[in-house]
């Protein structure tokens, strides 16, 4: 970058070199040039020379102010004409940043996915802070009050091995830049309580011919978790609001759930899974299509990510329904 | 087999107002939205709203809400798109598009606006 | 407002090429974009929808993949019909704003 240049003199910034976006900053340029008393000093930023708010100050030292910089990165030099030279001569460069400090991490969520391995540590980090920013995981064992930690970027990943000091922690986030220092509240975690099961996959769907149409959506999951709750969003492609359907499902079997839709309408599925009672919520699966047909012929239509499913003994699933509407990934 | 029918051309002037058809057939009108978008010369496309004839619900473009309005005219299939007090930065190519919530599947083979004195 | 960033803009390549263009969403939009075809004179054409969804009647040469903010369509084995522009949009909120297209010439 600019600041491996050779210099012949000084650039330096006031009140440093990052710093709070929106704030006046002077940029002063010292030159050490030997056999020159400078001219004139000129400032370049991004390699475009300015033109304004540039004050001699002595000699051989010049400022640059800048009023509410709001650049998030910007590469500053400065040059000197000296007389009797033809070009101007460069004295020094430096990379200046401005950004925000961290806002107080929240929302701390941990979850362990099944067969990961891992537990899988997220929170919202806010404002976008646009420096370079290092979150510390702080993982504290209520049993052994051993504490660990974590440096990463953004989300941590733990391996579940590691985790020696039984099963009640206390996690909490630090977030740090060069601006400032903010920490989370502290959660509380059981391992048993947290753990996501194997993600549910709707396989494929059929329409069977009766006296009223019905179709069926074959689902299952890898999970070894045995009281597992479920449930299965659908609606017609043309409508905003989800018809949600709620299990409770034994994974022994795949599983059929039988739905009555209107004849030539396009659906779309999607199941999630929790351990039954716990607190968090599998990611809702990918998005599954069916085309009911017009008339009572047998349609099938197969999951995108599967080209054929061994679908082994199946069961009927008990349901409930009720109506919600995610107007986020809808109009509304 | 589906089909979604526009004029080729529309040529108004500025200040005016002008109402685009698309003629939809060989489907349940009122069971799909129908859309619009537009692509000024050289441009990329637009989404500008839509409407759902089995409800009349609308959604509009914040960008196009004062110089759109959408209707229907179930009668005839029909769904319009009016443009008003035209600029000649409103000269484009309007497309409609039959569509749910994850895909537009069937366009027309949109209409070209000319705002010209 | 959401932004899709499509690259590249332009693309010079051979019949029986393979090419990948991309989309990249300004936040994650759960698979909720699709890709059409546009050819002068001729209406825009669905190719994918919901990331990996094949619409009726579109070749097998076309595929669609990617999750949270990077998709992108794939076309094996280009053929002389595939040459024009394509566009993504997502559909994850309105406005359900379009990627500014990639040409796609013959070399």
């Known amino acids: 970058g600019i600041t491996n240049i050779n210099c012949s003199g000084h650039i330096w910034v006031e009140p440093a070199t990052i710093f709070k976006m929106g704030m006046n900053i002077s940029i002063y340029c010292q030159a050490a040039i030997k056999n020159c008393q400078p001219r004139k000093l000129h400032f370049y930023k991004n390699g475009i020379k300015e033109r304004f708010q540039i004050t001699r100050i002595n000699k051989t030292t010049a400022r640059l102010w800048y009023k509410n910089f709001l650049e998030p990165h910007a590469s500053m030099y400065c040059t000197a004409e000296c007389p009797k030279h033809f070009q101007e001569t460069l004295i020094c460069g430096k990379d200046i940043s401005s950004g925000y400090p961290p806002d107080i991490p929240d929302e701390v969520t941990c979850v362990i996915y099944e067969y990961s391995g891992n537990m899988t540590c997220t929170w919202n980090a806010g404002k976008l802070t646009y420096i370079d920013t290092k979150y510390v995981v702080h993982v504290k064992s209520l049993e052994t009050e051993e504490e660990q930690q974590y440096l990463t970027s953004s989300y941590i990943n733990i391996s579940t091995d590691s985790l020696q000091g039984g099963k009640k922690y206390l996690v909490w986030v630090q977030a740090a830049n060069a601006l400032g220092m903010e920490e989370s509240k502290q959660l509380q975690i059981h391992l048993d309580d947290i753990v996501i099961p194997s993600a549910a996959v709707i396989s494929r769907a059929e329409t069977i011919n009766a006296t009223v149409p019905k179709t069926i959506i074959y689902w299952d999951s890898q999970t070894t978790i045995e009281k597992v709750s479920c449930e299965m969003r659908y609606k017609a492609t043309t409508n905003q609001t989800w018809n949600v359907k709620e299990f409770d499902t034994n994974f022994t079997y795949v599983q059929q759930s039988e739905f009555y839709l209107e004849p030539n309408i396009k659906y779309v599925f999607q199941v999630r899974c929790q351990e039954t009672g716990k607190r968090y919520w599998q990611p809702w699966s990918s998005l599954f299509f069916h085309k009911t047909p017009e008339t009572v012929p047998q349609v099938t239509s197969k999951a995108f990510q599967h080209d054929t499913w061994n679908s082994g003994l199946t069961v009927a699933s008990i349901s409930t329904g009720h109506l919600t509407s995610d107007n986020r990934g809808d109009i509304g | 087999q589906v089909q979604l029918q526009q004029p080729g051309a529309e040529l108004v002037k500025p200040g005016a107002s002008v109402k685009v058809s698309c003629k939809a057939s060989g489907y349940t009108f009122t069971k799909y939205w129908i859309n619009w978008m537009n692509q000024r010369p050289g441009q990329g496309l637009e989404w500008i709203g839509n409407?759902?004839?089995?409800?009349?619900?609308?959604n509009y473009n914040e960008k196009f809400k004062s110089k759109v309005t959408l209707t229907v005219d179930i009668s005839s299939s029909t769904a319009y798109m009016q443009l008003s007090s035209l600029t000649s930065d409103d000269s484009a190519v309007y497309y409609c598009?039959?569509?749910?919530?994850?895909?537009?599947?069937?366009w027309g083979q949109g209409t070209t606006l000319t705002v010209s004195s | 407002d959401i932004q899709m960033t499509q690259s590249p803009a332009s693309l010079s390549v051979s019949v029986g090429e393979t090419v990948t263009i991309t989309c990249r969403a300004s936040?994650?939009?759960?698979?909720?974009i699709t890709w059409y075809q546009l050819k002068q004179g001729k209406s825009p054409q669905l190719l994918v929808y919901a990331s990996t969804n094949l619409a009726d009647d579109v070749p097998s040469r076309f595929s669609g993949s990617g999750s949270g903010t990077q998709y992108s369509l794939k076309i094996n084995s280009l053929l002389s019909e595939d040459f024009g522009t394509y566009y993504c949009?997502?559909?994850?909120?309105?406005?359900?704003?379009f990627g500014g297209g990639t040409k796609l010439e013959m070399k």
């Open positions: 598009a039959r569509g749910d919530f994850y895909a537009l599947d069937y």
């Open positions: 409407i759902y004839p089995g409800s009349i619900s609308t």
């Open positions: 936040e994650n939009i759960y698979s909720h």
């Open positions: 949009q997502h559909f994850w909120g309105t406005p359900w704003t």
